[in-house]
Interface confidence: medium
């Protein structure tokens, strides 16, 4: 099941995701998508990086940490209830079936009405970076190059999900999709 994170309407949400670059500057492509991690790539991409830089992003989604050191945690600015749902962090580690995939569930709560202004308490406070859940820790990378970003391990379960949600439904970008690099 997905790891759950919470934020209030109007706050910034923080979704942790990390890897350890094999060497400084040896970056691994990463994508963030709305919806559960498919087998390849990300569905409904909101941000992605390549071996050098962030090469695609959408408004309100950004990397607050030092992504060059492997902190690819996603910050979603000024969240609304519509931001609730599953998010996929996919670390596209080169090598056969080496992709790291993390599904993070974001729950947005209505803003509390408070009599006096208080310091904003966002995800960073509620979920400090060091307290990431199992599976979100460092993923050692070995080599870089033109190697596959394929991970077949989810096809079985996701294929079942696809069947359950009707394959004829255009295999649209949803939580039950499969994608290739």
């Amino acid at each position: 099941s997905e790891v759950e994170y919470r934020a209030e309407v109007g706050q910034n949400a923080y979704l942790p995701c990390f890897y350890t670059p094999a060497a400084p500057g040896n970056l691994v492509p990463v994508c963030w998508g709305k919806g559960a991690c498919p087998v390849f790539e990300c569905g409904n991409v909101v941000l992605r990086t390549d071996e050098r830089d962030v090469n695609y992003w959408t408004s309100r989604y950004w990397l607050n940490g030092d992504f060059r050191k492997g902190d690819v945690s996603l910050t979603i600015e000024n969240v609304t209830l519509a931001d609730s749902g599953i998010y996929c962090c996919r670390i596209q580690i080169p090598g056969i079936m080496n992709d790291e995939k993390f599904n993070l569930k974001l729950v947005i709560k209505p803003a509390k009405v408070t009599p006096a202004p208080t310091r904003q308490r966002d995800f960073t406070a509620a979920f400090p970076r060091m307290l990431t859940t199992r599976g979100h820790g460092p993923a050692e990378t070995q080599t870089l190059g033109s190697l596959p970003d394929i991970n077949l391990t989810q096809i079985s379960t996701l294929a079942n999900e696809l069947r359950d949600s009707r394959l004829a439904n255009d295999l649209r970008d949803s939580g039950a999709t499969i994608r290739i690099g």
Epitope: P38, E41, I96, I180, G181
Partner: antibody, heavy 116, light 106 residues
Framework: QVQLVQSGSELKKPGASVKVSCKAS????????MTWVRQAPGQGLEWMGL????????IYAQGFTGRFVLSLDTSVSTAYLQISSLKAEDTAIYYC?????????WGQGTTVTVSS | QSVLTQPPSVSVALGQTARITCGGN??????VHWYQQKPGQAPVLVIY???NRPSGIPERFSGSNSGNTATLTISRAQAGDEADYYC?????????FGGGTKLTVL
């Protein structure tokens, strides 16, 4: 070296079936999925489907469900495409391809001709 | 499902630069791959993940991807570059190809 070798050309009558094979060599077969691509005469490339070589699970593109079946024989590192109830519009070259970042290895193609 | 739009044909003078485009809604959010197909041959991957060249592909081939357009650039075009070129993305588990562009080297 890494290669995919497909079976030879086929001439079939409408309503018949055909099974195209794709034998992989030079790499660990079940470390990669296998995809199939169709190219009708004078037309572009059309993605048909994918099979997980570890589990046999399949994904088919719209338009390639029902009559089209992807299968495996992992003991001989071979993927298969079977088409039943052949129609004239199934006349095409059928390619198998290995997906990594893109499809980096392709078979030479198998021409299937459906004619009465 | 993504729809990828390519010009049916592009001409380039020998030694000049050819640019083949692949249009798609917000294609910049996806990884785009390019294939070269010569008559009677299987396709060959020439660019993967927007701008990366597989080993054996000349440096003359390069790619970019931003916004709603991905571009394959072939510099110092040679007669041997004459072929059909296809862009491709993965969308909801299914592969999607552009309609293909026939490159003619004059």
């Amino acid at each position: 070296q890494v290669q995919l070798v497909q079976s030879g050309s086929e001439l079939k009558k409408p309503g018949a079936s055909v099974k195209v094979s794709c034998k992989a060599s030079g790499y660990t077969f079940n470390n990669y999925a296998m995809t199939w691509v169709r190219q009708a005469p004078g037309q572009g490339l059309e993605w048909m489907g994918l099979i997980n070589t570890k589990t046999g699970d399949t994904i088919y593109a719209q338009g390639f469900t029902g009559r089209f079946v992807l299968s495996l024989d992992t003991s001989v590192s071979t993927a298969y495409l079977q088409i039943s109830s052949l129609k004239a519009e199934d006349t095409a070259i059928y390619y198998c391809a290995r997906p990594t970042y893109g499809m980096d290895v392709w078979g030479q193609g198998t021409t299937v001709t459906v004619s009465s | 499902q993504s729809v990828l739009t390519q010009p049916p044909s592009v001409s380039v003078a020998l030694g000049q630069t050819a640019r083949i485009t692949c249009g798609g809604n917000n294609i910049g959010s996806k990884n785009v791959h390019w294939y070269q197909q010569k008559p009677g041959q299987a396709p060959v991957l020439v660019i993967y993940r927007d701008s990366n060249r597989p080993s054996g592909i000349p440096e003359r081939f390069s790619g970019s991807n931003s916004g709603n357009t991905a571009t394959l650039t072939i510099s110092r075009a040679q007669a041997g570059d004459e072929a059909d070129y296809y862009c491709q993305v993965w969308d909801s588990s299914t592969g999607v190809f552009g309609g293909g562009t026939k490159l003619t080297v004059l």
